[in-house]
């Protein structure tokens, strides 16, 4: 080993190496949550720009750059400390237009904490071994949506769009003219029946056991759908995320309810299917993985 | 394709009356905002002649009201225009206007679903 590479394996086995990196990643957060820093924090940038840049050194020439099996590059965390270095370079010295998205990547200075906390970076590797168990059961939740979702687009295609109209028109108006005419809140607000309060004009439906319209109102398919046209099942990918929501328990009641309204209260079994597969089954089967993958972790 | 039944047209005289049918029998038909007749005299414009709300209310062109009588049998999903003390400037291409809802076998659809139009013609 030459003289200079067995200067770097010292500094870097240090402890006070570790302690001055550590110090310098947490004042660097503290500069960085300062909303209007005065001037003087330009230089104090270019420090923490040095300090990583004589860490990045020492580690290479400790332990060399790529060639090899435990060197620089080869330590997936020494990724982060060279992106950090090189977007540091990029946004002071090349003029790149706008520069404020790349600003953006200093935060991953804070991400530097990681790797030199130990505890941390023990719950971290976890945190990335139970994504890639996670793998499988994702396949199959994202199976179970899909079949799930494919089913709701046949059940309920443009049912969302039923809407309770107004059983009186001007003698030049039909429903094709209204159609054609519906732009404003206003106009929707003129021809359909709002309970009040409500910003989605009332649901039905055509079977008997759908939701009525009250009197002087009929039910029609016309317009957009509830909560400005995002709660539909009128595309695989609307009804895919009608399932999501389901399976999360996003205010799910709500979509249970304006379908159940729209559709027929037999559809209610669709529901309980979906809220016992999707939501107490496929969700208790991903935190049981990661809890595995936790335990393992730690063993 | 979806297909209003429109019948009762003729030639009367000046005075006469005539009764106008407008069946929506199909199956796809299934709940309408209106069922009306409208009338396209040559060289006009479709104007309405008088329309029945599923509800049973009904609207009246001015022109028709006092001699036209609309009503309709939701039985047999008929609508029916009485007509009478006819003039000649009643001669015109009747409509039969279907203003609601229909199934296609897989979805609803709401619109406006026109006959194919029955002439009466009212001369001496």
């Known amino acids: 080993f030459s003289p200079l590479r067995r200067i770097s394996i010292k500094i870097l086995v240090h402890s006070l190496f570790s302690m001055l990196i550590m110090c310098t990643i947490l004042t660097n957060c503290i500069f960085m949550t300062m909303n209007n820093p005065p001037d003087w924090t330009k230089n104090v940038e270019y420090t923490f720009t040095g300090i990583y840049t004589f860490e990045s050194l020492v580690k290479i020439l400790a332990r060399g750059f790529c060639v090899g099996e435990f060197t620089f590059l080869r330590d997936p965390w020494n990724w982060l400390d060279f992106v950090v270095i090189v977007f540091a370079y990029l946004t002071e010295f090349v003029n790149l237009g706008n520069v404020s998205a790349l600003r953006t990547f200093r935060v991953l200075r804070a991400l530097k904490t990681i790797s030199v906390i130990p505890g941390l970076k023990t719950i971290v590797g976890a945190l990335i071994q139970s994504v890639k168990k996670l793998s499988d059961v994702m396949i199959l939740t994202v199976f179970c949506l899909s079949v799930f979702a494919l089913i709701g687009l046949q059940l309920f295609m443009g049912n969302l769009k039923h809407k309770c109209f107004r059983n009186s028109l001007e003698n030049n108006e039909t429903l094709e003219s209204i159609m054609n005419t519906l732009e404003s809140e206003e106009d929707f607000r003129k021809y359909f029946y709002y309970l009040e309060g409500s910003k989605d004009a009332l649901l039905c439906g055509f079977s008997t056991d759908s939701g009525q319209c009250p009197e002087g109102y009929t039910c029609v398919k016309i317009g957009r759908n509830p909560d400005y046209g995002y709660t539909s099942f009128d595309t695989f990918s609307w009804a895919f995320l009608a399932l999501f929501r389901l399976m999360t328990q996003d205010y799910w009641e709500n979509l249970y309810q304006q379908t159940l309204r729209a559709a027929g209260k037999t559809y209610m079994i669709f529901f309980v299917v979906v809220i016992f597969l999707g939501s107490f089954y496929l969700i208790n089967l991903i935190l049981a993985v990661v809890a595995m993958a936790y335990e393992e972790q730690n063993q | 394709e979806v297909q209003l039944v429109e019948s009762g047209g003729g030639v009367v005289q000046p005075g006469g009356s005539l009764r106008l049918s407008c069946a929506a029998s199909s199956r796809q038909f299934i709940r309408d905002v209106f069922t009306g007749w409208y009338r396209q005299a040559p060289g006009k414009q479709r104007e309405l002649v008088a329309r029945i709300y599923n509800e049973g209310n009904t609207q009246y062109a001015d022109s028709a009201k006092g001699r036209f009588t609309i009503s309709r049998d939701n039985a047999k999903k008929t609508v029916y225009l009485q007509m009478n003390s006819l003039r000649p400037e009643d001669t015109a291409l009747y409509y039969c206007?279907?203003?609601?809802?229909?199934?296609?076998?897989?979805?609803?659809?709401?619109?406006?679903?026109w006959g194919q139009g029955t002439l009466v013609t009212v001369s001496s």
């Open positions: 206007l279907f203003s609601g809802t229909i199934s296609t076998g897989r979805e609803y659809r709401s619109g406006d679903y």
